[in-house]
């Protein structure tokens, strides 16, 4: 993965109550199933419609889950992480890292590679160009007066 991706990273504590069909999301990652280059963390790959996580509304696809009920998810095999979630009980506390991508490049945490967010340069370049055109037109107008 070359290039640079800038993120606005925020952390949040999310408390979920296990629903009839569990926690209502899918996970990827682990030391044996890296989802992100050089990161064996656990990520949310899918939110189940009308599941516990979807009804709560805060957990998003692409979020990194740092801990479950205070237990760190670092350096776990994928299946060990799955078992941790499945045995976490009725009330589950998740420490979650949200990442908002603010500049394009190779996608860091979205495995399927769909760019989320608009690259800054795509906004700045047209704005700068418009400013220059407006300044030039203004100067021409002043010279004619």
């Amino acid at each position: 993965m070359n290039g640079r991706v800038d993120y606005l990273v925020t952390e949040e504590e999310i408390n979920l109550t296990r629903g009839p069909s569990g926690l209502g999301f899918n996970i990827v990652g682990g030391t044996d199933q890296q989802y992100v280059s050089n990161d064996s963390g656990i990520y949310v790959s899918r939110i189940k419609e009308n599941g516990a996580a979807a009804l709560d509304g805060r957990l998003q696809e692409g979020d990194k889950i740092l801990s479950v009920n205070g237990q760190d998810l670092k350096n776990l095999l994928h299946q060990d992480a799955v078992d941790l979630f499945r045995n976490a009980g009725y009330a589950v506390s998740l420490r979650v890292q949200h990442r908002l991508q603010v500049q394009n490049g190779p996608i860091g945490h979205r495995g399927e590679g769909d760019p989320s967010g608009i690259p800054i340069f795509m906004v700045l370049v047209p704005v700068f160009a418009l400013t220059m055109v407006a300044a030039w037109a203004f100067m021409r107008y002043r010279q004619q007066l």
Epitope: L23, F25, N26, V28, Q33, V44, R46, V82, R86, E112
Partner: nanobody, 125 residues
Framework: QVQLVESGGGLVQAGDSLRLSCAAS????????MAWFRQAPGKERDFVAT????????NYADSVKGRFTISRDNAKNTVTLQMNSLQPEDTAVYYC???????????????????WGQGTQVTVS
Amino acid sequence: QVQLVESGGGLVQAGDSLRLSCAASGITFRWYTMAWFRQAPGKERDFVATINWSGSDTNYADSVKGRFTISRDNAKNTVTLQMNSLQPEDTAVYYCAGVPGTSLSGETDPRDYDYWGQGTQVTVS
């Protein structure tokens, strides 16, 4: 573009065997939970079998346990369903399905899967 393409269906006699294959493209296959479902005429789509990302964990519908075997090859992006001792009640269109990651909800509901193949017809006479 995600594509799941099934093959291997056909017309067989009761007691015969058949091997269905599903070739996946457009996804990072090794991250996906894969499954087979089937739909008989006039009936709902039913769960047949599922397999986790590494192939180490499988789950089967009671009606096919001991007769059907699901497997996967992550190097070739394929999932297969070996069907033995086929019975007339196994007649259906068989669908391959996939979803990213491991579910913490369940894997037997068609709504748990995002991607589907077009299906392959299996007829047991």
